[in-house]
């Protein structure tokens, strides 16, 4: 019958410094069946050299991550008796240090009242198509929203956070990027914390 | 799991026929690849067409078979290939060939077919 | 539209040979390429998929290799139920590019 779409994940996670290594992990069905990773629209070549036994796991180690592994992935499973799964949902794997570092600021302050909402700006030297805020946390992975610059032949990116409140940490960085390479981002604007009152 | 091809037979020049494959030990609720082969008296393998039993329902055709040859999937244990204007060249064994390893219908159209029917002759002549 | 080009046609070789097929890509396919053996009267019957990755059941003497526009199959210590037909095909690219079969290879064994 149907098999399920399977779940897949990058561990320590989807945006990554270059050099640095990664894991695509794609997890489905039964022990039988055998996994397979895609990039949408570009072959990606890197996975056709993972020895079989990882594939079989359903794991895709990347020991130090370049451009060339950037791209949109979507993963399957199945059998020759039991057919293929859904393709799961997609993972954008993002590589970053492609450019010199964006800087991010609060306006009009960092300091923001809890319940408030704040204006973050993302300002690059050079002129970019695409902006990326990250909220970062202790222990989870960047949660990343993407913009594009606030008026035409702009390098400046607006984002508006809130309502904030003092019962977590609010860390944020942004990136920017051209958007002909939407998955090879900037080297990381400094770390913005907010402050937040109350 | 077999797969089994319907009687093909003598047709005449200008004709038409409908070849259907039918699935035992297995249902096309589970997502595959279905494709035609054919191969000519002492020729060649030949890819016509497929057709996924995916949602998608999505369909591929070699360039030279688009307009005369239409595949579709008739039931849950059959698909059909329906072929018209048939010429002399068309005198083939038409297989019918199962795989499951693609990637998404549209970018990797095909896959590799790991089963097979016996095959079926289809003679065109007058 | 992509063509597989097999060579040679057809080979002769001794029982305990190696005999070696080549397939060659107008265009890069990476490493999706399979390979069939053939006998008269019958079915295709895959023996390698993704250029060099052993389908279920085939002897470890069939052995695949290359990626790209250059492919190989070697058949090592030939046995005289080795004597087929075998075949190339690609399966990657959309449908401007095409997706088929090699020409083919007659093994014949002395």
């Known amino acids: 019958g149907h098999l399920p779409k399977p779940t897949l994940w990058a561990e320590p996670g989807s945006v990554i410094t270059q050099g640095s290594p990664v894991t695509l992990r794609c997890q489905g069905g039964q022990e039988t069946q055998e996994y397979r990773l895609y990039r949408e629209k570009k072959t990606a070549l890197w996975i056709t050299r993972i020895p079989q036994e990882l594939v079989k796991k359903g794991q895709f180690p990347i020991p130090s991550i370049t451009w060339e592994h950037a791209g949109r992935y979507r993963c399957y499973y199945g059998s020759d008796t039991a057919g293929r799964s859904e393709s799961s949902d997609p993972l954008e794997l993002v590589v970053t240090g492609a450019y010199i570092k964006p800087t991010l600021s609060a306006q009009p302050s960092p300091v923001v009242n809890s319940g408030g909402n704040v204006i973050l700006q993302c300002d690059s030297q050079v002129a970019f198509d695409g902006f990326s805020l990250c909220k970062e946390g202790e222990d989870e992975h960047p949660q990343c929203l993407n913009s594009q610059p606030h008026a035409r032949g702009s390098s400046r990116a607006i984002f508006s956070v809130g309502p904030v409140s003092p019962s977590r940490r609010w860390w944020y960085r942004c990136y920017a990027y051209d958007s002909n390479s939407p998955y090879e981002w900037s080297l990381p604007s400094d770390l913005l914390e907010l402050l937040v009152l109350g | 799991q077999s797969l089994e091809e319907s009687e093909g037979g003598l047709v005449k020049p200008g004709g038409t026929l409908t070849l259907t494959c039918t699935a035992s030990?297995?249902?096309?609720?589970?997502?595959?690849?279905m494709c035609w082969v054919r191969q000519a008296p002492g020729k060649g393998l030949e890819l016509i067409a497929c057709?996924?039993?995916?949602?998608?329902?999505?369909t591929y055709y070699a360039s030279w078979a688009k307009g005369r040859f239409t595949i579709s999937k008739s039931s849950s244990t059959t698909i059909t290939l329906q072929m018209t204007s048939l010429t002399a060249a068309d005198t083939a064994t038409y297989f019918c060939?199962?795989?499951?390893?693609?990637?998404?219908?549209?970018?990797?159209?095909?896959?590799?077919?790991?089963?097979w029917g016996p095959g079926t002759l289809v003679t065109v002549s007058s | 539209e992509l063509d597989l080009t097999q060579t040679p046609s057809s080979v002769e070789a001794a029982v305990g040979g190696t005999v070696t097929i080549k397939c060659q890509a107008s265009q890069t396919i990476y490493t999706n390429l399979a390979w069939y053996q053939q006998k008269p009267g019958q079915p295709p019957n895959l023996l390698i998929y993704?250029?060099?990755t052993l389908a279920s059941g085939v002897s470890s003497r069939f052995k695949g290799s290359g990626s790209g526009t250059e492919f190989t199959l070697t058949i090592s210590d030939l046995e005289c139920a080795d004597a087929a037909t075998y075949y190339c095909?690609?399966?990657?690219?959309?449908?401007?590019?095409?997706?088929?079969f090699g020409g083919g290879t007659e093994v014949e064994i002395k």
């Open positions: 060939a199962r795989g499951w390893d693609y990637e998404d219908p549209g970018y990797t159209d095909t896959t590799y077919f790991s089963l």
């Open positions: 993704a250029a060099s």
């Open positions: 057709i996924y039993t995916d949602s998608s329902g999505a």
């Open positions: 030990g297995f249902s096309f609720s589970s997502s595959y690849c």
């Open positions: 095909q690609s399966y990657y690219g959309s449908s401007t590019t095409g997706n088929g």
